[in-house]
């Protein structure tokens, strides 16, 4: 899971100020038991700082340690930091710990850019605020790292959620998830609810606002309004998705399906932006860049570096198009949509200007390994991982910012013909040249 | 080779408005490539950005002067223009016009400057 | 907000010396970074933009460097007409409206 560009965004506040909540509809589809309903104890769990990760309190070893843990469905180790770091305000001290045991054996994870490297042990592990479980689960005690933690990110460890295949140093290293659903009654399923602030916070604010939630074992209705569509899961490895259509304001980019998906597309929360692949992002822009043809913006800004600055509370957000990513549904010839706003991928950056201007940086990038369904996409939803049925929901979050012309949206069904072939097939490869990091 | 020219009064009277005038030659104020701004330098100090517009019409102003700032575009008579409310001594400053290029995003092209002195 | 501080604010030189101007930014501006040129009586003139390119025209003597928060305005070798007062500006934040408060190069 790559570092800067693919940390996740940014925390919100539960109410999406700056933005409107949408009203609750009413709920369609039966109850199915210990999977569906209200999980109270797990609502709010989470919260983070723009650009920096969205993160989750556990507690790890005898008597228990607290740490904050960042939430990444783009990885599939459990690592925390277990030695001094002039970023770390705690790590994990194994030697605390009456229940760690060493595994005798190391883990070293490149980035693209830095990299971690640590012991792998196991230890018992539980989420305070979530189901009320402990487990024994592998944990990398991170021992030495570079470019990992960030400074006032105010987490520090990092919890894979995807499968043993992309697990570091190899397949044998059962992620945590896994430990859980097996060593528990806990439901082979967890949802995301990802709350953009839509305006940055500072330190303090951070410390004190909900950044969203993970519901671990179930959904909560109150996370979400409308019906929860769902995609296949690819392959049990990212969390790999299939996109049949790209849509900017309604307009197709037309391009070969593949193309979405070259050489994958994944839903990914340890990842900021939306991440296209090169042919793909630069057809978007194009295409961004004409609908919002009123006002011209730097180059450096499309290229996710320049800020523009606007008076505050003027933002154009009219001129911005919306994006419509079509995915895979379950039946045969059927697809659905989800639809973001310039309040998704327009990324509100703090400190930069003065207290009277919103700042903000292009949240789409370019990438030379697939799309990247980070969380510029995640903040419009409700996402549903569920294991258990192969496959991922997506329903519009309660907690997603817009205003009162326009909202995140999902919709379907569509009928679109020949999806399978929109998958790519990555050659097989040696393991060892898998890159971790996305560039 | 485009040439920029501010023309307007040398002297305001404190609490009028004051008004310039950037005629540009040689070029056009509807390029698709360029914003044009105004930029000003109180008598032996440093330069202070005034605000910013594009051929459209969009307009961006520096938040300490935005209250009092208009900035507005005539694409026809290829001339953009600065009005500026409630002047005090405190705004007698050289004006500068400019054109912001090399990826719109610094000054690459400027006019000479008027001096405005704002005095009853 | 972010602030480009200059320094020195005065640096007194011979012709034919080499000037080193630093520009700071209270944050990292990227590459973000202009220098301009000014000599009394006339308008600002670009001489860098993007930290290290050259504007048209500009003598191969300017040469500027730097990311981030530093950065360097270097006259290899000062002739008369160099002496003037120069200003760093940064566009990370757009539409460009920072300028630092210049430093003045003046003949010893």
């Known amino acids: 899971t790559q570092h800067g560009i693919r940390l996740p965004l940014r925390s919100g506040l539960g109410g999406a100020p700056l933005g409107l909540r949408l009203p609750r509809e009413t709920d369609e589809e039966p109850e199915e038991p210990g999977r569906r309903g209200s999980f109270v104890e797990m609502v709010d769990n989470l919260r983070g700082k723009s650009g920096q990760g969205y993160y989750v309190e556990m507690t790890v070893g005898s008597p228990p340690q607290t740490l904050n843990i960042l939430v990444d469905t783009g990885s599939s180790n459990f690592a925390v930091g277990a030695a001094p770091h002039p970023f770390l305000h705690r790590y994990y001290q194994r030697q605390l710990s009456s229940t760690y045991r060493d595994l005798r054996k190391g883990v070293y994870v490149p980035y693209t850019q830095g990299k971690w490297e640590g012991e792998l042990g196991t230890d018992l592990v539980s989420i305070p605020h979530g189901p009320n479980v402990t487990v024994r689960a592998n944990i990398a005690a991170i021992t030495e790292s570079d470019k990992f933690f960030i400074n006032g990110s105010n987490w520090e460890g990092i919890l894979g959620l995807a499968y043993a295949e992309i697990a570091r140093p190899d397949d044998s290293l059962e992620p945590f998830f896994d430990s859980l659903v097996k060593q528990t009654h806990v439901p082979n399923l967890f949802s995301l609810q990802l709350c953009g602030a839509g305006f940055p916070l500072n330190q303090s604010e951070v410390l004190a606002s909900v950044g969203g939630s993970m519901i671990i074992g179930g959904i909560d209705h109150s996370l979400y309004t409308g019906s929860l569509w769902y995609t296949p899961i690819r392959r049990e490895w990212y969390y790999e998705v299939i996109i049949v259509r790209v849509e900017i304001n309604g307009q197709d980019l037309k391009m070969d399906c593949k193309e979405y998906n070259y050489d994958k597309s994944i839903v990914d929360s340890g990842t900021t932006n939306l991440r296209l692949p090169k042919k793909v992002f630069e057809a978007a822009v194009k295409s961004i860049k004409a609908a919002s043809s009123t006002e011209k913006f730097p180059d450096g800004f499309w290229l996710g570096e320049q800020l523009v600055c606007w008076q505050a509370g003027t933002t154009p957000w009219n001129i911005f198009p919306v994006i419509s990513l079509y995915l895979m549904g379950e039946v045969t010839n059927q697809s659905f949509r989800i639809t973001i706003l310039p309040q998704q991928y327009l990324r509100p950056v703090e400190d930069v200007a003065t207290s009277q201007d919103d700042c903000y940086k292009f949240a789409i990038s370019q990438s030379s390994t697939g799309t990247v369904m980070g969380a510029v996409i995640m903040e419009g939803f409700y996402v549903v991982f569920d294991r258990a049925r192969k496959r991922i929901g997506f329903a519009v979050s309660a907690c997603h910012v817009h205003d009162e012309f326009r909202t995140a949206a999902v919709e379907g069904p569509f009928v679109t013909l020949d999806m399978e072939d929109c998958g790519y097939n990555i050659p097989q490869t040696d393991e060892s040249t898998l890159m971790t990091g996305r560039a | 080779q485009l040439q920029l020219q501010e023309s307007g009064p040398g002297l305001v009277k404190p609490s009028e408005t004051l008004s310039l005038t950037c005629t540009v030659s040689?070029?056009?104020?509807?390029?698709?490539?360029?914003?044009w701004g105004w930029i000003r330098q109180p008598p032996g100090k440093g330069l202070e950005w005034i605000g910013s517009i594009y051929r459209s019409g969009s307009t961006y102003y520096n938040p300490s002067l935005r209250s009092r700032v208009t900035i507005s575009v005539d694409t026809s008579k290829n001339q953009f223009s600065l009005k500026l409310s409630s002047v005090t001594a405190a705004d007698t400053a050289v004006y500068y016009c400019a054109r912001v290029g090399h990826g719109i995003s610094y000054f690459d092209l400027w006019g000479r400057g008027t001096l405005v002195t704002v005095s009853s | 907000e972010i602030v480009l501080t200059q320094s020195p604010a005065t640096l007194s030189l011979s012709p034919g010396e080499r000037a080193t101007l630093s520009c700071r930014a209270s944050q990292s501006v990227s590459s973000y970074l202009a220098w301009y040129q000014q000599k009394p009586g006339q308008a600002p003139r670009l001489l860098i933009y993007d930290a290290s390119n050259r504007a048209t025209g500009i003598p191969a003597r300017f040469s500027g460097s730097g990311s981030g928060t530093d950065f360097t305005l270097t006259i290899s070798s000062l002739e008369p007409e160099d002496f003037a007062v120069y200003y760093c500006q940064q566009s990370l934040t757009w539409p460009p409206r920072t300028f630092g408060g210049g430093t003045k190069v003046e003949i010893k």
């Open positions: 040689g070029g056009s104020t509807s390029s698709s490539s360029y914003y």
